[in-house]
Interface confidence: low
């Protein structure tokens, strides 16, 4: 780990990587880009998957939070021998399969996909890629695209969530290192703190949720604050205000002293959730306090 900016968000991160014949001489640059970026997502609740595509899509490393498995996955990634066609949709299919089946404690964890390709997708392949990216989106994923060399930015803007979710690398593969910071900044959604972190039992409160990336949602009207109470009941609340670095949310009224509410955020109307280690607890407040 080389220090510098990091992301503390708890979500599922999928790398979908082009290993078609055209990247044969540039695989190392792709690998080092992924390796450096992967090390910047440091939450123990963050899971990661590596998927490669050419004439078919292959899950090189299934979703895992195990850092040793991630290290081994990176080793496997480094050994990849590129070749074949650019069937990007196959990569998205492998991601969607995992998103669909990887439920955590009965509801879905938020997913972020970073897809990298170097070429223009021709007609049908573009349609299939957009279609499969849309399927991932409908399962709650936020989709970013990195385009290197001969990519078509208009195509990638339709595969990604928007033009703002595309990272063009016009100066060739060696310039991939230069976008690590901007990708990290844009793709990181993290909950860092809640103010107040202790509330009075039986009283209504507003909570300021501090973090980053809350306006990365495709539609900020779909952002929700979620409170998982005593590891059982989950209550979703619509924020009064959504800013990039904080949310202002109504807190649920917790009637008993000692109750705990784990804070989560959904960017998509409760379809999936960013997890955190932030807990709000209740205490007894005497009259006038």
């Amino acid at each position: 780990e080389d220090g510098g900016p990091a992301c503390y968000g708890g979500f599922d991160l999928y790398f979908i990587l082009d290993k078609s014949g055209s990247v044969l001489h540039h695989w190392n640059e792709i690998y080092y880009f992924v390796e450096q970026l992967a090390h910047k997502f440091i939450s123990p609740q963050l899971r990661m998957s590596f998927i490669v595509f050419s004439t078919r899509g292959t899950t090189l490393m299934k979703l895992t939070e195990d850092r040793e498995q991630i290290r081994q996955g990176l080793e496997e990634l480094q050994k990849v021998l590129p070749g074949g066609d650019t069937y990007m949709h196959e990569g998205f299919e492998r991601a969607s399969e995992q998103i669909y089946y990887e439920n955590r404690q009965g509801y879905r964890t938020a997913s972020v996909i970073i897809a990298l390709t170097d070429g223009e997708l021709h007609e049908d392949l573009f349609f299939y890629s957009e279609r499969e990216a849309n399927r991932s989106r409908d399962l709650g994923a936020i989709v970013y695209c990195v385009g290197v060399k001969d990519f078509n930015e208009t195509q990638l803007a339709r595969i990604a969530d928007s033009k703002d979710h595309v990272f063009p690398v016009n100066d060739g593969f060696q310039a991939l290192q230069g976008i690590i910071h901007s990708i990290l900044k844009k793709s990181c959604i993290e909950i860092l703190a809640a103010e107040p972190s202790t509330i009075c039992a039986g009283e209504s409160f507003q909570v300021v949720v501090r973090g980053n990336g809350f306006r990365h949602a495709r539609n900020v009207d779909r952002v929700l604050c979620s409170f998982k109470i005593n590891d059982s009941v989950t209550l979703n609340e619509k924020p009064f205000s959504v800013e990039d670095t904080y949310l202002l949310c109504p807190a649920p009224i917790l009637k008993e002293v000692g109750m705990k509410a784990a804070l989560q955020v959904s960017m998509n109307d409760g379809l999936s959730f960013i997890s955190s280690s932030v807990i709000i607890t209740t205490t007894h407040c005497s009259d006038g306090s």
Partner: antibody, heavy 126, light 108 residues
Framework: QVQLVQSGGGVVQPGRPLRLSCAAS????????MSWVRQAPGKGLEWVSA????????YYADSVKGRFTISRDNSKNTLYLQMNSLRAEDTAVYYC???????????????????WGQGTTVTVSS | SSELTQDPAVSVALGQTVRITCQGD??????ASWYQQKPGQAPVLVIY???NRPSGIPDRVSGSRSGNTASLTITGAQAEDEADYYC???????????FGGGTELTVL
Amino acid sequence: QVQLVQSGGGVVQPGRPLRLSCAASGFNLGSYAMSWVRQAPGKGLEWVSAISGSGGSTYYADSVKGRFTISRDNSKNTLYLQMNSLRAEDTAVYYCAKILGPGNLNYYYYYGMDVWGQGTTVTVSS
Amino acid sequence: SSELTQDPAVSVALGQTVRITCQGDSLRNSYASWYQQKPGQAPVLVIYGNNNRPSGIPDRVSGSRSGNTASLTITGAQAEDEADYYCNSRDSSGNHVVFGGGTELTVL
């Protein structure tokens, strides 16, 4: 058995309001996006409105925007359509329908509507 | 005016194959669904996501999509297939749902 049972139709004068209800059974309404579709006498189907599973996002056809409000009470497993300032051209059979797929109603991956109510007739006439 | 265009009426001889088409720019990047509606009844979903049949729909009913055209094919048409058929997708803006004008199928 998954079904939608509608109520609330009737004859109403122009400019007056009316509220339609759609009670779901056999599935958890809150897990799905829902929609209202109408059919004027002798005409085809016309999409009216849709709402996400949580109720946080709503969508309207231009012909009803500003006059109709879609809502849901997930605790009662019921969908509503509040129709204000009704016009003669709103006369139709109104259907509620369950939208296939995840409840966030992302139209990029809209599949279709798999469960429909029996329909309720709204007649706007003086 | 509808963004999805269907032929108003189509006829088919009993036991023959009929294809009902639906055209619209929005179909290039979205999925088509198809509904059967008989007089006085609510619509019934027969195809979703271009080519998927819900359970209970016979396999002589199939769907496909190519470019901006979606098709519903009934192989070996039966008397009970006589109905109105509507195609449906999201519109080209991506914010709304749109229906085709409907096709009345007559089985001769």
